[in-house]
Amino acid sequence: LPAQVAFTPYAPEPGSTCRLREYYDQTAQMCCSKCSPGQHAKVFCTKTSDTVCDSCEDSTYTQLWNWVPECLSCGSRCSSDQVETQACTREQNRICTCRPGWYCALSKQEGCRLCAPLRKCRPGFGVARPGTETSDVVCKPCAPGTFSNTTSSTDICRPHQICNVVAIPGNASMDAVCTSTSPTRSMAPGAVHLPQPVSTRSQHTQPTPEPSTAPSTSFLLPMGPSPPAEGSTGD
């Protein structure tokens, strides 16, 4: 004969676990139903009555099958230096990421808690490592024979033009000036731009500060608790 299918709530066999989308209730000592994403437990189970679930209220969510008595609060609205990449629904939290030209100075479980503007390398310095979604630009002094005359978070050091006759020698922040009308270059002319950071969700690593950069704003990073993780809600 096929095994009888147990309906929740039921007492599990000794040594066995509850099925998928069920949890073991320590007080009732029964396997009881979890609530689906977008819901929470309004009434916990007893020995004879199963869990009663209810929908999450506005601005709250549950992402997993759960038996939490209260839905989690969605994060606060995205700030002006952020874009909302995922809206707050009953089943998912709002996710804010940094807008172009900014990076995440303080990440959270999903998205970013605090964005900061990408560092701009001043004239005489070029981008050594481009900014990403979670790390700042790293600048380096332009090596002999190269220059950067811009304040930019994307420009690298470019080679000086090679003159037949040099009118003014180039330095780290200025190209060479030729007297001849036909200068040559060791590389194609024109500014070299690095691409803007691509959206990734890599873990934030604190960039190494460079003394040779344009002054940048200091940020006081709030270190409050992250939004609470759903309590014991895995399947």
Partner: antibody
Framework: QVTLKESGPALVKPTQTLTLTCTFS??????????VGWIRQPPGKALEWLAH???????FYNPSLKSRLTISKDTSKNQVVLTMTNMDPVDTATYYC???????????WGQGTTVTVSS | DVQMTQSPSSLSASVGDRVTITCKAS??????IAWYQQKPGKAPKLLIH???TLQPGIPSRFSGSGSGTDFTFTISSLQPEDIATYYC????????FGGGTKVEIK
């Protein structure tokens, strides 16, 4: 508005059985998620949970007192009754009844009734 | 049975002080803890449930935190009317109260 009130004898003799009644209003024990429990507090001591009963007649007892306790309900009268056998002077306490929410914490309490066990 | 160890058993603080009470559970109770205030001769009054959810009408100076086995109850700025005994209640596995903390004004 939710109210609960305990009633019963102020004095019982050792070995006797104590019967306490909780009469409540503002909610019904026929509503899913509702429960009523009993808690006691000896003079100058901490609170101790004794027992409670749910809307669906599921009952829970403090394991250390289970053999002496019985809880029952009369839904039509809005009453819950607790009996405790073989009373002893150490059972002298204020006995409270309280409402339990569907997520299992006590939110409303009665004013308490003082029971002295003495010969 | 789950045991709840509440500390300190009593404390004396000045008006405006920050007061912290802890409860430690003998096993994991998730976030199923409530905090009650009891004044002499009165029934306990629910302040907080599910670790940190404040009951309607309870002042925001009361707060709670923790999960698993370690829980904290805080009065951010003690007021004269806060003189009482405070109890934690675990309701993750049956029901157990802590031993209580008597709060007095210096």
């Amino acid at each position: 508005q939710v109210t609960l009130k305990e009633s019963g004898p102020a004095l019982v003799k050792p070995t006797q059985t104590l019967t306490l009644t909780c009469t409540f209003s503002g909610f019904s024990l026929s509503t899913s998620g509702m429960g009523v429990g009993w808690i006691r507090q000896p003079p100058g001591k901490a609170l101790e949970w004794l027992a409670h009963i749910w809307w669906d007649d599921d009952k829970f007892y403090n394991p250390s007192l289970k053999s002496r306790l019985t809880i029952s309900k009369d839904t039509s009268k809005n009453q819950v009754v607790l009996t405790m056998t073989n009373m002893d002077p150490v059972d002298t306490a204020t006995y409270y009844c309280a409402r339990l929410t569907g997520t299992r914490y006590f939110d409303y309490w009665g004013q308490g009734t003082t029971v002295t066990v003495s010969s | 049975d789950v045991q709840m160890t509440q500390s300190p058993s009593s404390l004396s603080a000045s008006v405006g002080d920050r007061v912290t009470i802890t409860c430690k559970a003998s096993q994991d109770i998730n976030k199923f803890i409530a905090w009650y205030q009891q004044k002499p001769g009165k029934a306990p009054k629910l302040l907080i449930h599910y670790t940190s959810t404040l009951q309607p009408g309870i002042p925001s100076r009361f707060s709670g935190s923790g999960s698993g086995t370690d829980f904290t109850f805080t009065i951010s700025s003690l007021q004269p009317e806060d003189i009482a005994t405070y109890y934690c209640l675990q309701y993750g596995n049956l029901w157990t109260f802590g031993g209580g903390t008597k709060v007095e004004i210096k």
